[in-house]
């Protein structure tokens, strides 16, 4: 079954190369086991960032190499990636699966387009 | 279009094993997760596994966790569902599945295995 997944148009990274954006979808029941996928689309490929799955009010658990971090609070889901840099700009999309309890649901959002400026290194002060 | 063929289904009693397949004859599945889902009568269609065909990663239900596994073949092209330890609650029509890509859904579906569990 299909499920509508909201996300910002666009997001800044910052000087840091810290992006955080919302995702959030529309639950027809109450999902007590979710599971996330972020999704990176640049030059027509897709490839997959991170992958989290949560138990309701609980943090997202990815893996430990992950470059994301998140948490939940009722159907939003609050995604930040870490380490950016200029080349990882690009559209990336918010996959979400209602895992359980039955009936199983899956969306995928429209994609938060996230610009990322390598900081200018400082000048060499004498 | 891709045709998932299930096999496998069948009577058996508690604490049994059965192992189901499924088939998509002439095609690769190459860029595709595919998984195993269950319905009981009257219920919603439930999650029970899939595995991405790229790297073989894994992802389990709870209620089967420990005791089903699921496996690919690609020389077969085939996907597995070994269940073990069977329990009448695990008694539905198991339906294949194939996404056909990560912007996907659940695009591709077999026609469903009967999988009775008895006390």
């Known amino acids: 079954k299909a499920m509508h997944v909201a996300q910002p148009a666009v997001v800044l990274a910052s000087s840091r190369g810290i992006a955080s954006f919302v995702c959030e979808y529309a639950s027809p029941g109450k999902a007590t086991e979710v599971r996330v996928t972020v999704l990176r689309q640049a030059d027509s490929q897709v490839t997959e960032v991170c992958a989290a799955t949560y138990m309701m009010g609980n943090e997202l658990t990815f893996l430990d190499d992950s470059i994301c971090t998140g948490t939940s609070s009722g159907n939003q889901v609050n995604l930040t990636i870490q380490g950016l840099r200029a080349m990882d700009t690009g559209l990336y999309i918010c996959k979400v699966e209602l895992m359980y309890p039955p009936p199983y649901y899956l969306g995928i959002g429209n994609g938060t387009q996230i610009y990322v400026i390598d900081p200018e290194p400082c000048p060499d002060s004498d | 279009k891709v045709q998932l063929v299930e096999s496998g289904g069948g009577l058996v009693q508690a604490g049994g094993s059965l192992r189901l397949s499924c088939a998509a004859p002439?095609?690769?599945?190459?860029?595709?997760?595919m998984g195993w889902f269950r319905q009981a009568p009257g219920k919603g269609r439930e999650f029970v596994a899939d595995i991405r065909w790229s790297d073989g990663r894994t992802y389990y239900a709870d209620s089967v966790k420990g005791r089903f596994t699921v496996s690919r073949d690609n020389a077969k092209n085939t996907v597995y569902l070994q269940m073990n330890s069977l329990k009448p609650e695990d008694t539905a029509v198991y339906y294949c599945?194939?996404?056909?890509?990560?912007?996907?859904?659940?695009?591709?579906w077999g026609q469903g295995t009967q999988v009775t569990v008895s006390s």
């Open positions: 599945a194939a996404q056909g890509g990560v912007l996907s859904g659940w695009d591709y």
């Open positions: 002439g095609r690769t599945f190459s860029n595709y997760a």
